[in-house]
Interface confidence: low
């Protein structure tokens, strides 16, 4: 029959050229002499001359090595004519499929990938995705199937397996608990992409993972106990500056302190504000204190942050003992 099954030709063939691929044959050759020809891109149109045919035998010839990454499939037409030039067959489709060789290494799309993840996230949390491309075939072969792996992690704290990479998607995820921005703010991972699904050529890139701040540290009073002396009747008088420490990112809502007088100020004599730079709590008198009415106030102040805690954290409380100092007041008649 005047039919040719698709022809598979490996790319980068060594020859010798011309290389016989397949024989075109018309059964009309019993009646008359047949001449064969081919047309189409790769034959009589660009890229011309890649393929040829032995006019009388019908052998299809490959004239040079093929490159699948340039052209993966050629669609030619075979023709059969009699000696007088009359067509004896309908044009026949000839498909030439260029089969892949692993002649390309994977290439990362960037030398350095950057991603970020919140501290304290659970294992399984996705961080970022790296991508390597491989021009080879990944559908019918493993030549272009890239497997990703993490080669090294710096620093190795709290241990050397904080992240994992999905071998086929390149998605980097957290694999261990213990990401703590306050201890390690950034990790550098050396990542590898290896074709042949992990058994072939390897290329390397860097993934930098920034650990983002979460409000996982409560502000803590330091010290927790204060004593202060205030003259009676003084309004707007600075009583005490309360100091807190907070390990979260400075000047962020997770660091900025919010103070609240929880107890001991029944007469609403005091107020507390946050100093914008130092983050200290500035305790001042809202109204004058009366030594004769009460010569000592014990205040309890709680501190939280502007941002909510990302988990339940104990709040820190300070105790301030305020001694009211007597002022010699004019007698009242």
């Amino acid at each position: 029959d005047w039919v040719v099954a698709p022809i598979s030709v490996p790319e980068n063939g060594k020859g010798p050229f011309p290389q016989r691929l397949n024989q075109l044959k018309s059964n009309k050759d019993r009646d008359t002499k047949i001449f064969y020809s081919i047309t189409g891109p790769g034959a009589d149109s660009p890229p011309e001359g890649v393929f040829a045919v032995e006019k009388e035998t019908g052998w299809l010839l490959l004239n040079k090595p093929l490159d699948r990454e340039e052209i993966a499939k050629y669609e030619l037409y075979g023709h059969a004519v009699s000696e007088n030039g009359a067509s004896v067959e309908e044009p026949m489709n000839i498909s030439i499929i260029v089969t892949d060789q692993n002649d390309n290494k994977p290439k990362f799309t960037q030398d350095t990938f950057r991603g970020s993840v919140l501290e304290g996230v659970l294992p399984g949390t996705s961080v970022m995705q790296v991508t390597a491309t491989d021009e080879d075939d990944a559908i019918y072969t493993y030549n272009g199937v890239v497997a990703y792996s993490i080669h090294s992690q710096e620093p190795k704290d709290p241990h050397d397996l904080m992240f994992t990479i999905h071998r086929s998607t390149g998605t980097i995820s957290v694999i261990s608990s213990g990401l703590d921005r306050e201890k390690v703010p950034e990790y550098t991972l050396t990542i590898q992409a290896t074709d042949m699904d992990g058994d072939g050529s390897t290329t390397t890139a860097v993934a930098v993972v920034e650990i983002l701040d979460a409000n996982d540290n409560a502000p803590m009073f330091d010290p927790q106990k204060y004593e202060a002396h205030v003259p009676e009747n003084a309004v707007g008088h600075e009583v005490q500056r309360l100091t807190v420490t907070d390990l979260d990112a400075p000047n962020s809502p997770a660091w900025r302190a919010t103070y609240l007088i929880m107890g001991g100020d029944d007469g609403d004599h005091f107020t507390i504000t946050t100093h914008p730079e130092s983050n200290q709590g500035i305790l001042t008198t809202r109204k004058g204190l009366d030594f004769e009415a009460k010569n000592q106030h014990t205040l309890y102040v709680e501190v939280t942050n502007e941002a909510p805690f990302v988990l339940k954290l104990p709040t820190s409380t300070a105790t301030i003992v305020v001694h009211v100092e007597d002022v010699n007041e004019a007698p009242v008649f």
Epitope: L118, P308, L311
Partner: antibody
């Protein structure tokens, strides 16, 4: 399937109070925050506050302190919001919405269908 | 209190187009920004949280980006169901605040 089902529409008189509810199912009610959000007709969204049913901890938008009171009943997986001394400004649709305690990074991932409160004499 | 500026306030687009909505904040909120869509008469639906993470079941034509004080939501190849009101929301500091909204209308 996580569901947040709210109580029906309310028509109340000025000066009165109303208590609306939000019943949760399909997730750990006690360990997720329940938020309440106000939406006036044709307007945007306004956060009222939230409650952590596990221990009853609440956080309010200062604007709604004294107006809204948030409570929760763990046994029935139901959160409540009471609105007091109602005026026409309180006429709105009120949504409840869940936040996972940490995993969703404080985004509200499941919302009730909304409860319409109309204040009119 | 944190100020949020969402723009544009409204926009008209056709099915198949790509649109971008932006949200600017008065202070750094890192990546703690969410985007919601609300259709007429319905409750809001979470689309994106932590600036760029797609919520469960949200089509990949939605993408969020940005950090600090500048964020954007991009919708590729608009579908009929994408029309409605879009809100950005700070989910970092109290009070949780929403942008004024963007009304996305069909052209």
């Amino acid at each position: 399937v996580q569901l947040v089902e709210q109580s029906g529409a309310e028509l109340v008189k000025p000066g009165a109070s109303v208590k609306i509810s939000c019943k949760a199912s399909g997730y750990a009610f006690s360990s997720s925050w329940m938020n309440w959000v106000k939406q006036r007709p044709g307007k945007g969204l306004e956060w009222i506050g939230r409650i952590y049913p596990g221990d009853g901890e609440t956080k309010y938008n200062g604007k709604f302190k004294g107006k809204a009171t948030l409570t929760a009943d763990k046994s029935s997986s139901t959160a409540y919001m009471q609105l007091s001394t109602l005026t026409s400004e309180d006429s709105a649709v009120y949504f409840c919405a869940r936040q996972r305690d940490y995993g969703a990074l404080y985004a509200m991932d499941y919302w009730g269908q909304g409860t319409s409160v109309t204040v009119s004499s | 209190e944190l100020q949020m500026t969402q723009s544009p306030a409204s926009l008209s687009a056709s099915v198949g187009e790509t649109v971008t909505i932006t949200c600017r904040l008065s202070e750094n909120i890192y990546s703690y920004l969410a985007w919601y869509r609300q259709k007429e008469g319905e409750s809001p639906q979470l689309l994106v949280y932590n600036s760029k993470t797609l919520a469960e079941g949200v089509p990949s034509r939605f993408s969020g980006s940005g950090s600090g004080t500048q964020f954007s939501l991009k919708i590729n190849s608009l579908q009929p169901e994408d029309f409605g009101n879009y809100y950005c929301q700070n989910h970092y500091g109290f009070p949780f605040t929403f942008g004024a909204g963007t009304k996305l209308e069909i052209k």
